[in-house]
């Protein structure tokens, strides 16, 4: 049970925070699934990628995404070294040169082809909301998270502590 203030303490200054380095500190491949074990899949359609949330057939291979972890500079009133650590942001890339982007105007999550340096819309603050589950908060819009709506990924505003652990913003990462 974590209050929203615990989240806001770090994310209020996200608009001003900058990535420490242009290179990620860590990268690895993982598949992404929802709290209810539906898989996040990516399909090339009409020269653009679509994102789906669906049940996979037995033995069907899960799509993998490259998770890249970047250290963020804390605002000046936050300690950024040693035992206090630096906030981590991630980018998610299911295929070369394509990254998940937050479209805040449309409240949607899209795959965009782009070159580095990546735009802020491609960065998400990582949260451990629930045991074995993570959540992705928009760097460009604190309090807004990637979530599941009508079998698609969407941006969902989290405006109270009760909603912090709502199932539709919880995701599982799996390397198998």
């Amino acid at each position: 049970a974590f209050g929203i203030s615990g989240v806001q303490k770090y994310t209020r200054a996200l608009h001003d925070s900058s990535i420490t380095g242009i290179s990620p500190i860590t990268e690895y491949l993982a598949s992404l699934s929802t709290y209810n074990d539906q898989s996040i899949t990516f399909a090339l359609e009409d020269e653009s990628y679509e994102i789906y949330v669906e049940d996979l057939k037995k033995d069907e291979k899960k799509d993998k995404v490259l998770l890249s972890y970047y250290e963020s500079q804390h605002p000046s009133n936050e300690s950024g070294d040693g035992v206090d650590g630096k906030m981590l942001m991630v980018t998610l890339s299911p295929t070369k040169d394509f990254w998940l982007h937050a479209n805040n105007k449309e409240h949607s999550v899209e795959l965009h082809k782009c070159e580095k340096p990546l735009p802020d819309q491609a960065f998400f603050v990582l949260h451990n909301m629930h045991s074995n589950c993570v959540s992705f908060e928009c760097k460009t819009d604190p309090g807004v998270f990637i979530g599941v709506k009508d079998n698609h990924l969407a941006l969902i505003k989290v405006d109270s502590s009760e909603n912090l652990c709502t199932e539709n913003i919880l995701f599982k990462l799996s390397e198998t």
Partner: nanobody, 121 residues
């Protein structure tokens, strides 16, 4: 809030082995990954190996087949077994962990102070 303490570094001859350990302590709620980076004099810090909470691993090309990363979740400890060491492996080896604490859900990056590994004849 989170402390990482490395051990196991030292001076070895080429072809020999070392095993590094890194223990995490403090108000740890969830660990997402633990890994090792290294920094040689005059060079940038680089990723050596990482192991995730699900057991997935990733290695730098230069150490594949020689180094093995493993993790003991019960002790929040990560190990790096380094075999067939080469002079170019000489560096300070830093432990890195991504974790959240009991005071916040935000995942943060924590670093140890580093342990020196020197490979020389």
């Amino acid at each position: 809030q989170v402390q990482l303490v490395e051990s196991g570094g030292g001076l070895v001859q080429p072809g020999e082995s070392l095993r590094l350990s890194c223990a995490a302590s403090g108000s740890i709620r969830t660990v997402n990954y633990m890994g090792w980076h290294r920094q040689a004099p005059g060079k940038q810090r680089e990723l050596v190996a990482v192991v995730t909470s699900g057991g997935g691993t990733n290695y730098a090309d230069s150490v594949k087949g020689r180094f093995t990363i493993s993790r003991d979740d019960t002790k929040n400890t990560v190990y790096l077994a380094m075999n067939s060491l080469k002079p170019e492996d000489t560096a300070v080896y830093y432990c890195n962990a991504a974790a959240s604490t009991y005071s916040s859900t935000v995942v943060r990056s924590f670093w140890g102070q580093g342990t020196q590994v020197t490979v020389s004849s």
